[in-house]
Interface confidence: low
């Protein structure tokens, strides 16, 4: 059945970029890297320069959701992390600019960002029970939990 957010009329308006050029490391200290033009994967890196750098943009919900809603973009590109279905890899979708308004099926571009101490979770707005996750010998995907790893540490330049 269609996710709840597809059926609702919730509109998300772009607010601002809130983080630039950060790295996501999973609980095994693996960094997210580019697997190819379309997919991401995770690997233990000696040189963090090889890790994907992300920018995070914040959106505000028309129903003033208590959760902060974000879009993830690969820094210095026009590639945005896009959710598919459970256990499917997240895709890198190219768009000419950051969407000013997102609603309906386009909510697959959005994630609820939650923090618990140093752990960061990104839940799909389109699939609210699924998280961005890493999985052994697989792409970065959407998953509901173990054996996939759903918590990430954000590593930033301390500007």
């Amino acid at each position: 059945s269609a996710p709840f957010s597809f059926l609702s009329n919730v509109k998300y308006n772009f607010m601002r970029i809130i983080k630039y050029e950060f790295i996501l490391n999973d609980a095994l200290n693996q960094s997210i890297i580019r697997a190819n033009d379309q997919y991401l994967t995770a690997a233990a890196l000696h040189n963090l320069d090889e890790a994907v750098k992300f920018d995070m943009g914040a959106y505000k919900s028309s129903k003033d959701d208590a959760k902060i809603t974000v879009i993830l973009r690969i820094s210095k590109t026009q590639l945005y992390v896009t959710a598919q279905d459970e256990d499917q890899p997240v895709l890198l979708k190219e768009m000419p600019e950051i969407p000013k308004t997102i609603t309906g099926s386009e909510t697959n571009l959005l994630f609820f960002w939650e923090t618990h101490g140093t752990k960061n979770y990104f839940t799909s707005v389109a699939h609210p029970n699924l998280f961005i996750a890493t999985k052994q010998d697989y792409w970065v995907c959407l998953a509901g939990g173990p054996p996939s790893i759903t918590d990430f540490q954000i590593l930033e330049n301390q500007a």
Partner: antibody, heavy 122, light 107 residues
């Protein structure tokens, strides 16, 4: 109506600390970072740093690192700035200022508190 | 740190005059340039952000332009209530420095 209301004027001795509060209302506090800016008498504006009101992480300008701390009480939508080891040159008006909503200039400040005068004198 | 050089430091003009203030950054700031107005004893107010975008509610006689390192702030027809000090600020690189200000007075 969006408002940032700061605590009252303070007079401190050199070496002491001061803590200034900034209570926000009229918007969702955690969606907008909070800056702290100071202005010495007859001088320009000096940005001390910023706190991410969602995560609580802070960024401090080099000139203030080690002496300033930004904190939050999200339950009351209040930001705090504490400056320690005060000296006479810290005499200034201290402002809190909210990050702008709009894309493109992430470090513009669209709403400001009324300012808190801190006087450091022996 | 990026240095912001504002000129002139003070300016006297008549009501109705076109007033221009310039701000030069020590390096390219990619249009991340903001202009504030501060009246005596008051907090600064944002007028223009991202070099040329007018904050909603700000009168259209205020405008901004520029790119790279050189930026201009213009009041097309000076009004008595525009008497204030004007500051530029770069929002490109921490610590997001301000110009030293331009004090605007009425002749």
């Amino acid at each position: 109506e969006i408002q940032l209301v700061q605590s009252g004027a303070e007079v401190k001795k050199p070496g002491a600390s001061v803590k200034v509060s900034c209570k926000a209302s009229g918007y969702t506090f955690k969606y907008y970072g909070m800056n702290w800016v100071r202005q010495a008498p007859g001088q320009g504006l000096e940005r001390m740093g910023w706190i991410n009101t969602y995560t609580g992480e802070s960024r401090y300008a080099d000139d203030f690192k080690g002496r300033v701390t930004f904190t939050l009480d999200t339950s009351t939508s209040t930001a705090y700035m504490e400056l320690s080891s005060l000296r006479s040159e810290d005499t200034a008006v201290y402002y809190c200022a909210r990050d702008i909503y709009y894309f493109g200039s992430d470090y513009a400040m669209d709403y400001w508190g009324q300012g808190t005068t801190v006087t450091v004198s022996s | 740190d990026i240095q912001m050089t504002q000129s002139p430091s003070s300016l006297s003009a008549s009501v109705g005059d076109r007033v221009t203030i310039t701000c030069r950054a020590s390096q390219d700031i990619s249009n991340r340039l903001n202009w504030y107005q501060q009246k005596p004893g008051k907090a600064p107010k944002l007028l223009i952000y991202y070099a040329s975008r007018l904050k909603p509610g700000v009168p259209s006689r205020f405008s901004g332009s520029g790119s790279g390192t050189d930026y201009t702030f213009t009041i097309s027809s000076l009004q008595p209530e525009d008497i204030a000090t004007y500051f530029c600020q770069q929002g490109n690189t921490p610590p997001y420095t301000f110009g030293q200000g331009t004090k605007l007075e009425i002749k």
